[in-house]
Amino acid sequence: ELCDDDPPEIPHATFKAMAYKEGTMLNCECKRGFRRIKSGSLYMLCTGNSSHSSWDNQCQCTSSATRNTTKQVTPQPEEQKERKTTEMQSPMQPVDQASLPGHCREPPPWENEATERIYHFVVGQMVYYQCVQGYRALHRGPAESVCKMTHGKTRWTQPQLICTGEMETSQFPGEEKPQASPEGRPESETSCLVTTTDFQIQTEMAATMETSIFTTEYQ
């Protein structure tokens, strides 16, 4: 099931997926002056079985100089419902994230691809936020958002990362200092937290993700 909305926008922060759930689509976008090859794939699709996941289809771009247009390729109408845009970055998957069963790694770049990637995320997808350069997180640890299905509707949990100005860039998971805790709310020392938001507290009574008060139960 595709997620109905984009991941939340957090002031002075960007998000990135560390691994992509099966069913995720990545539009085959080309940079200005190039177009998708004739009969080329519209998108790459993360598919797989119980032991291995990979991207089906390959994106290919060719020069559009011979055609009377430099228009950038956009998704077909049926694809335009979900446009998840992330800036192109070098893959930063921690091993435990990228090797998750049922997940694909960041697809390698293709020649003349667009500067931004447009993903169509599925329920269960997790993205991580970091403060942009010049800003620093008030709290320590990764800020996450997960696409969930609730009452028949999809929604992204709210990370509420607070990035304050004139500070150095914070880090993505995998580059964290040891013992990092989720962004935003004080977390119980005995609990395991998947998604967090500022203004939330998890108490020590919360021993599992499903019984986490404030955080998991109400997102």
Epitope: P11, R136, R140, Q179, R185, Q200
Partner: antibody
Framework: EVQLLESGGGLVQPGGSLRLSCAAS????????MHWVRQAPGKGLEWVSV????????YYADSVKGRFTISRDNSKNTLYLQMNSLRAEDTAVYYC???????WGQGTLVTVSS | QSVLTQPPSASGTPGQRVTISCTGS?????????VHWYQQLPGTAPKLLIY???ERPSGVPDRFSGSKSGTSASLAISGLRSEDEADYYC???????????FGGGTKLTVL
Amino acid sequence: EVQLLESGGGLVQPGGSLRLSCAASGFTFSSYGMHWVRQAPGKGLEWVSVISYDGSYKYYADSVKGRFTISRDNSKNTLYLQMNSLRAEDTAVYYCAAGVPDYWGQGTLVTVSS
Amino acid sequence: QSVLTQPPSASGTPGQRVTISCTGSSSNIGAGYDVHWYQQLPGTAPKLLIYSNNERPSGVPDRFSGSKSGTSASLAISGLRSEDEADYYCAAWDESLNGPVFGGGTKLTVL
């Protein structure tokens, strides 16, 4: 259970000093930004100061800048507020708050009067 | 003067629905920061009532709901009860202050 317990309040003369403490338990104190928020008698909430999880940066409300200093000792799970050059208008209940902020202590009363 | 603007008072009879507004600016609510609501009963510390615009912490009845649009937000209380009589504050991070800002508070009276 998450707990924040303030102490150090009391009666002080104008121009005097006080140091408030906030003992935290029940969560990973060293991972979260902490705040001081105050409430004058019969008035609303006013944010005073914030300190980042590692103490590397601090911000203050204009009304206390240059007079108050926020600090923390992560090894003791304790937040502090050093208040100097106190004025009558600083009279309030001072709350320690965790997050941005969601969980609050019960507060400690600071009275500045001659 | 508070950075976020709330009506000083609101009232309703038991069972009624009451709405409290909160207006901010481009440096707080309008900048994309979430709005949070607190309930403060007489003589007690503020308690988180709504977080991230419309989420309820565990134990908060679904009679309480929140919403946000542009530079404003609102708290709605349906099925008003006598125990809802309290002061209500909105809050949001403000990037010009690098700290949270609060509304002046709304005193809710249940008639």
